[in-house]
């Protein structure tokens, strides 16, 4: 008799990242016999929901559940009919939604369960949609990377899986980077961590991490633009504004009360005797980084050392993956390679800038104007915030990986928020583990 | 401001096939979804399928399954319908449109190119 | 596939008065909650313009003399009041379910 396949027992889960720009759908997969194993979760699938982040549905809630159908259909496209009952979807909303609830508790809560309400529609097994804190951004980006670099797992391997991938256990810290917020994860090298806030205490296949996080509200890199725009037009004789961080001939009207509309920007708030000015682009680097480096408080730290704004960060320990736009904006500026050293990012970033919008413009026809003008501002940001915010250097930056996916799978906090929620990490080490690969039977 | 321009009329034999493009400027491609769109003179609209740039897939109506393939090329921010054994009842003004929100607020708006003219005569 | 018939085929309208024209489904274009209704005008020689989009929601830009209503299989869309640059066809559209179909439209003229 021929041998027939058994049929595949596999389980999915689905994750939205809702977050200040946009939103995304992931689609997970894994093995149902081996929930506990290091690993064996990949991502299937990923759906961008074409469209803003769900904060800007604020004025026309009604329209959320129109916004999310394409990448909801594509879910049930996906996953096995069959198994759409038993698929618990989870969405998480992150910075852009923690901003408009500091503005109004009621505006955000109404958006959130039109959202519920909408994702209760499907036919998979809804289990809410939460604002998740930025410690909780921070851990779960942590958990993605190092379980998707298998750092959890006791087995070392003889082989890499990814280029940058060590052969030691050691965990790999997690530098996010997303529209409105910022996070940075890892494990100190014996350092107590002297902010109760920022200390995490996880326990995952039998070994115990203490690890440091921090989530720096509005210092994405789109807060992070309106900050040093508010902060910059203060001191503006006029309407007009030359900003170094755009390219020399680009020219943008902007309204002060677009301006002043995020809570990112209060601290800045003063009346100016106008209500729109111009950015004028003067492309200039070293301006441009001088005046980011104003964003970043580093004048008082009741800690032994600080990143910025008086946060505690203790002292960078071992590689560490940039995912998001970090990696994002890295990847345009072609700047992800690990032979690129700190010095030649700087130098690319001052050629880059210094180009001409007319020129930029022609050379990269297919990206939208007002995300191609942003990018000189985004670069020299993630540099300011590395290593004047984070206190990477020269020679540290070698420690830093640009990752947009490992194995498949993109690199951000859906990933470890699905393992946590659906309990697939376990505190001990399964007590069976699988096979090696040089056992036979 | 966004644009989708196609290319210009096409005069073809039967049994010949024709590939028509829609060049999208004004945003990224990968942010919306293209639908194709068919019309032939003094006629309804008929809905041929849609991509979505950023990952190729695609839906089509079965009755042009076999007849027309949608493809896109992110780094050209170009859309594409390769339409096969033309007849004529392939002669028809042919559109590339999107709909759907903008990426920057929640504004649903829509942009067609201007329709390209498919003759299909021996 | 679901069939989409369009009523009148044609009609006129006095300037300042309600054009209304109907639109039913052969099935419900209802799902998860959503009316997934659609109304284009075009002009000849130009392509469509969405007006209306999910049933009821204006398109960017949309003067608010028009709306669009209904549930289910029975949809109309309004224009009041009528005005000279609305004389055009219509067409209502159903994105529900794969393939997508349109109404055989509407001719509106000027009476």
């Known amino acids: 008799t021929q041998n027939k396949a058994l049929p595949e027992n596999v389980k999915y889960g689905i994750v939205l990242d809702a977050g200040s720009s946009h939103t995304s759908l992931y689609i997970y997969k894994w093995p149902a016999e081996k929930e506990n194993d290091t690993g064996v979760v990949h991502q299937v699938e990923e759906c961008r929901v074409k469209g803003p982040g769900i904060s800007k549905f604020v004025q026309k809630v009604n329209e959320i559940g129109i916004y999310l159908t394409d990448c909801m259909e594509r879910a049930r496209e996906v996953i096995p009919a069959a198994k759409h009952h038993a698929t618990p979807v989870y969405l998480g909303a992150t910075a852009g939604m923690r901003l408009l609830r500091m503005e109004s508790e009621e505006l955000a809560d109404r958006v959130l369960d039109v959202v519920e309400r909408s994702l209760s529609n499907y036919p998979f097994d809804f289990q809410g949609a939460r604002i998740i804190t930025g410690q909780e951004e921070g851990a779960y980006g942590w958990i993605t990377i190092n379980y998707l670099l298998g750092k959890f797992s006791q087995k070392t391997r003889w082989f890499s899986i990814v280029p940058y991938e060590t052969n030691n256990q050691e965990t790999f810290g997690a530098l996010d980077l997303g529209g409105a917020s910022t996070q940075v994860t890892f494990v100190p090298q014996n350092q107590t961590i002297e902010s109760p806030d920022n200390a995490l205490q996880f326990r995952l296949y039998g070994k115990d991490y203490n690890v440091y996080t921090h989530s720096f509200l509005c210092y994405g890199k789109d807060q992070a633009l309106w900050q040093k725009l508010a902060k910059d037009i203060q001191v503006a004789s006029n309407e007009i504004l030359r900003d170094p961080c755009f390219h020399p001939g680009y020219k943008k009207v902007v309204n002060v009360s677009d301006l002043y509309k995020t809570p990112c920007t209060k601290r800045f708030e003063m009346t100016l005797p106008f209500q729109q000015f111009e950015i004028q682009g003067i492309g200039n680097y070293q301006q441009c980084h001088q005046s980011i480096l104003e964003l970043f408080n580093t004048s008082y730290c009741p800690y032994s050392q600080c990143a910025f704004n008086g946060i505690f960060l203790p002292p960078l320990q071992g590689d560490f993956g940039a995912f998001s736009a970090f990696y994002f904006v890295m990847k345009f500026l072609n700047l992800t390679s690990e032979k690129v050293s700190q010095e030649k990012v700087t130098e690319m970033m001052k050629k880059f800038c210094a180009q001409p919008w007319e020129e930029i413009k022609t050379s990269y026809a297919g990206v939208k104007e007002k995300y191609l003008s942003e990018y000189c501002f985004s670069g020299t940001y993630i540099l300011s915030l590395l290593l004047q915010g984070y206190h990477f250097t020269a020679d540290s930056w070698e420690h830093i990986h640009f990752i947009g996916k490992i194995q498949g799978s993109d690199a951000g906090w859906t990933l470890g928020y699905m393992l946590n929620l659906t309990n697939m990490i376990p505190a001990e080490q399964p007590l069976s583990t699988p096979l090696s690969h040089s056992t036979y039977v | 401001e966004v644009q989708l321009q196609q290319s210009g009329a096409e005069l073809v034999k039967p049994g010949a096939s024709v590939k028509l493009s829609c060049i999208v400027s004004g945003f990224n491609i990968k942010d919306t979804y293209i639908n194709w769109v068919k019309q032939r003179p003094e006629q309804g609209l008929e809905w041929i399928g849609r991509?979505?740039?950023?990952?190729?897939?695609?839906k089509y109506d079965p009755k042009f399954q076999g007849k027309a393939t949608m493809t896109s090329d992110t780094s050209s921010n170009t859309a594409y319908l390769h339409l096969s054994s033309l007849t004529s009842d392939d002669s028809a003004v042919y559109y590339c449109?999107?709909?759907?929100?903008?990426?920057?607020?929640?504004?649903?708006?829509?942009?067609w190119g201007q329709g390209t003219t498919l003759t299909v005569s021996s | 596939d679901i069939v989409l018939t369009q009523s009148p085929a044609s009609l006129a309208v006095s300037l300042g008065q309600r054009a209304t024209i109907s639109c039913r489904a052969s099935e419900s274009v209802d799902n998860y909650g959503i009316s997934f209704m659609n109304w284009f005008q075009q002009k000849p020689g130009q392509p469509p313009k969405l007006l209306i989009y999910?049933?009821?929601n204006q398109g960017s830009g949309v003067p608010a003399r028009f709306s669009g209503s209904g549930s289910g299989t029975d949809f109309s869309l309004n224009i009041l009041p009528m005005e000279e640059v609305d004389a055009a066809m219509y067409f209502c559209?159903?994105?529900?379910?794969?393939?997508?179909?349109f109404g055989g439209g509407t001719k509106l003229e000027i009476k």
């Open positions: 559209h159903q994105s529900k379910e794969v393939p997508w179909t």
């Open positions: 991509i979505d740039p950023a990952n190729g897939n695609t």
């Open positions: 449109a999107r709909w759907g929100y903008d990426d920057e607020e929640a504004d649903y708006f829509d942009s």
């Open positions: 999910a049933a009821s």
